[in-house]
C-alpha cells in the first residue's frame, strides 16, 4: 500500500476581513492512525491553529465530521478573519504515540492572504490659520488595509492636486499597512468656500473611494481692507465718520475709534453681512461733535481681526475758520490721512 | 477578451419574480465590481446600484430598495440581478456592467442587456 | 444626488460636421465624467473616462474636454457610424448618474 499523503490542493487563498477562510486537506489513506494538527508558519516557532485530538478552537470548524472512521477530509473554516491571520498554514498528520503522538507528515502549505479595507482617510490642516498667497501643508491618514497596493489623490475646487507626498508603511512585509499623504495647497482670497479632498482607492473598495475632507474655511484668514469716509455734515456741529470693514475672514472683528489718540468707543462685529466668497463686510460709524475741539481732530479706525495684531485707518478733521468743500479718504494704505475743514 | 454575457429575455406577470444573470469572463471576476443600469423603452439609462465581488455588499440606488437584490455566484464568476414582485413599471432593458477602481471607477465593459417584460 | 443635464435631447448634424455635446453636473465632479455612445438595441460603449481619456479601439475624431462641472464631447468630423445617443455619466459620487441623452440624427 502506498504511504500516505498529506494533500493541501491551494498554494494560496484570498480572503476579505470579517470573511471565512477554507483550508483545504486531505488525507490518501486511513494509516497510519492518528489525528491530524493545523499550524500556521513552520519550525519550532510555528503556532496551533487546530489539534483534532484536544483543545478548544472556537473560531476554527471543520469541513467533514473527523469523528467518523473512514474520514480522509482534514479540511478547516477559520472564521472571522482579519489581516493577523495572514500566512501559511500547514495541515499536519501525526502517527499514534506512547506517551505522545509523532509528526508524520505535512502538507506543502497554504497561504492565506487577507485583503482588508483601509479605514476612513482623515485629513488635518494646519493649527494656525494662514492669509491668501500662504502654502499650507494637509496631511490625510487611512490604516489597516491590505495588501499594499493603494492609490491616493488630493482635490481642491474641482483640480486634482499635484504637489503632495505619499508614504506607505511599513516598507517590507506586513499584516496591514498604513497611509500617510502631505498636500501643499496655496491659499486664495476665494477659498473660505472652498475644500480640500483626499481620496483613497484600494481593490477592497472597487466600486467607491474613501474620502475624506477639510474645509479651508478652517483654514484661512482673509484680513479686512479699512476705509473711512466722512460724510455730510449731519447738523451744524456734527460730523459723520465711517469705517468700511470689507473682505474678512472669520467673524471675530473687534473694532476701536479713536479721537487724537483717545478712545472714544469700542465695538465686536456682529450684524455683518456676508459676500459671495464666505468673506464678511461690516460698517462703524462714528459721529463728532466738532465744536467740543479747539484744534485739528485726527480719527483713528482701529480694527483687531482674530487676534492678530491691529490695523488701522486714519482721518483728519481741520477745525478751520476757512469752509471747504467736504471728500472722502479712500487711501489704500493701513495709515493715511486726508485733510479735511469744518465749520 | 473580457466579455459580460447575460442570459436571455423574460416574460412575467405582474406579482412574479424574475433573475436575471450575468456571466464574466476574462478577467478576475473578484477585482471588480459589478454594476447594474436599467432602460425603459425609449428613455434614458438608470444607474440601480452596484455589488462588490469580493465582500459581497451591495449598493442600491434610492429607487431600486426594497424588491430588488444583488447576488453573486463567485466560483462560477456570475451575477445576478432579481427583482421580487414585478410591476409593469419594471419593463425594461437590464445592463450589468464591469466596474474599474483605483482613479477610474467607470463602467467599461457591459453586457448586451436582458430584456424583461410584464404584463398581465 | 448630482443632477448631470445635458442641454440638447437631440441634434440633426450633416455627415462631415462638428459636433458638440455639452454635459453640466449641478455639482463639481473633479473630472470623474464618463461618455457613453448607444446605438438601437445595443448595450453602452464607453468613449471617454476621466472627461478627457479616450478608451481604447475609439476613433480619435471623438475627444473630451471640461472640468469642474462642465463638460463637453466634440466630434471633429461626422461619420454614419457616429449616429447614436450619448450619455455623459458621473462617478464622482454615488448613486452614479447619468444624463438625459443626446441623440444625433442625420439631416
Known amino acids: 500500500e502506498e504511504e500516505l499523503q498529506v494533500i493541501q490542493p491551494d498554494k494560496s487563498v484570498l480572503v476579505a476581513a470579517g470573511e471565512t477562510a477554507t483550508l483545504r486537506c486531505t488525507a490518501t489513506s486511513l494509516i497510519p492512525v492518528g489525528p491530524i494538527q493545523w499550524f500556521r508558519g513552520a519550525g519550532p516557532g510555528r503556532e496551533l491553529i487546530y489539534n483534532q485530538k484536544e483543545g478548544h478552537f472556537p473560531r476554527v470548524t471543520t469541513v467533514s465530521d473527523l469523528t467518523k472512521r473512514n474520514n480522509m477530509d482534514f479540511s478547516i473554516r477559520i472564521g472571522n478573519i482579519t489581516p493577523a491571520d495572514a500566512g501559511t498554514y500547514y495541515c499536519v498528520k501525526f502517527r499514534k504515540g506512547s506517551p505522545d503522538d509523532v509528526e508524520f507528515k505535512s502538507g506543502a502549505g497554504t497561504e492565506l492572504s487577507v485583503r482588508a479595507k483601509p479605514s476612513a482617510p482623515v485629513v488635518s490642516g494646519p493649527a494656525a490659520r494662514a492669509t491668501p498667497q500662504h502654502t499650507v501643508s494637509f496631511t490625510c491618514e487611512s490604516h489597516g488595509f491590505s495588501p499594499r497596493d493603494i492609490t491616493l489623490k488630493w482635490f481642491k475646487n474641482g483640480n486634482e492636486l499635484s504637489d503632495f507626498q505619499t508614504n506607505v508603511d511599513p516598507v517590507g512585509e506586513s499584516v496591514s499597512y498604513s497611509i500617510h499623504s502631505t498636500a501643499k495647497v496655496v491659499l486664495t482670497r476665494e477659498d473660505v468656500h472652498s475644500q480640500v479632498i483626499c481620496e483613497v482607492a484600494h481593490v477592497t473598495l472597487q466600486g467607491d473611494p474613501l474620502r475624506g475632507t477639510a474645509n479651508l474655511s478652517e483654514t484661512i484668514r482673509v484680513p479686512p481692507t479699512l476705509e473711512v469716509t466722512q460724510q455730510p455734515v449731519r447738523a451744524e456741529n456734527q460730523v459723520n465718520v465711517t469705517c468700511q470693514v470689507r473682505k474678512f475672514y472669520p467673524q471675530r472683528l473687534q473694532l476701536t475709534w479713536l479721537e487724537n489718540g483717545n478712545v472714544s468707543r469700542t465695538e465686536t462685529a456682529s450684524t455683518v453681512t456676508e459676500n459671495k466668497d464666505g468673506t464678511y463686510n461690516w460698517m462703524s460709524w462714528l459721529l463728532v461733535n466738532v465744536s467740543a475741539h479747539r484744534d485739528d481732530v485726527k480719527l483713528t479706525c482701529q480694527v483687531e481681526h482674530d487676534g492678530q495684531p491691529a490695523v488701522s485707518k486714519s482721518h483728519d478733521l481741520k477745525v478751520s475758520a476757512h469752509p471747504k468743500e467736504q471728500g472722502s479718504n479712500t487711501a489704500a494704505e493701513n495709515t493715511g490721512s486726508n485733510e479735511r475743514n469744518i465749520y | 477578451q473580457i466579455q459580460l454575457v447575460q442570459s436571455g429575455p423574460e416574460l412575467k406577470k405582474p406579482g412574479e419574480t424574475v433573475k436575471i444573470s450575468c456571466k464574466a469572463s476574462?478577467?478576475?471576476?473578484?477585482?471588480?465590481?459589478m454594476h447594474w443600469v436599467k432602460q425603459a423603452p425609449g428613455k434614458g439609462l438608470k444607474w440601480m446600484g452596484w455589488?462588490?465581488?469580493?465582500?459581497?455588499?451591495?449598493t442600491y440606488a434610492e429607487d431600486f430598495k426594497g424588491r430588488f437584490a444583488f447576488f453573486l455566484e463567485t466560483s462560477a464568476s456570475t451575477a445576478y440581478l432579481q427583482i421580487n414582485n414585478v410591476k409593469n413599471e419594471d419593463t425594461a432593458t437590464y445592463f450589468c456592467?464591469?466596474?474599474?477602481?483605483?482613479?477610474?471607477?467607470?463602467?467599461?465593459?457591459w453586457g448586451q442587456g436582458t430584456s424583461v417584460i410584464v404584463s398581465s | 444626488d448630482i443632477q448631470m443635464t445635458q442641454s440638447s435631447s437631440s441634434f440633426s448634424v450633416s455627415l462631415g460636421d462638428r459636433v458638440t455635446i455639452t454635459c453640466k453636473a449641478s455639482?463639481?465632479?473633479?473630472?470623474?465624467l464618463a461618455w457613453y455612445q448607444q446605438k438601437p438595441g445595443n448595450a453602452p460603449r464607453l468613449l471617454i473616462s476621466g472627461a478627457t481619456s479616450l478608451e481604447t479601439g475609439v476613433p480619435s475624431r471623438f475627444s473630451g474636454s471640461g472640468s469642474g462641472k462642465d463638460y463637453t464631447l466634440s466630434i471633429t468630423s461626422l461619420q454614419t457610424e457616429d449616429v447614436a445617443t450619448y450619455y455623459c455619466?458621473?462617478?464622482?459620487?454615488?448613486?452614479?448618474?447619468f444624463g438625459g441623452g443626446t441623440k444625433l440624427e442625420i439631416k
Open positions: 455639482e463639481d465632479i473633479y473630472n470623474r
Open positions: 455589488k462588490n465581488t469580493e465582500t459581497g455588499e451591495s
Open positions: 456592467a464591469r466596474g474599474g477602481y483605483g482613479s477610474n471607477y467607470v463602467m467599461d465593459y
Open positions: 455619466q458621473q462617478y464622482w459620487n454615488s448613486p452614479r448618474t
Open positions: 476574462g478577467y478576475t471576476f473578484t477585482d471588480y465590481a
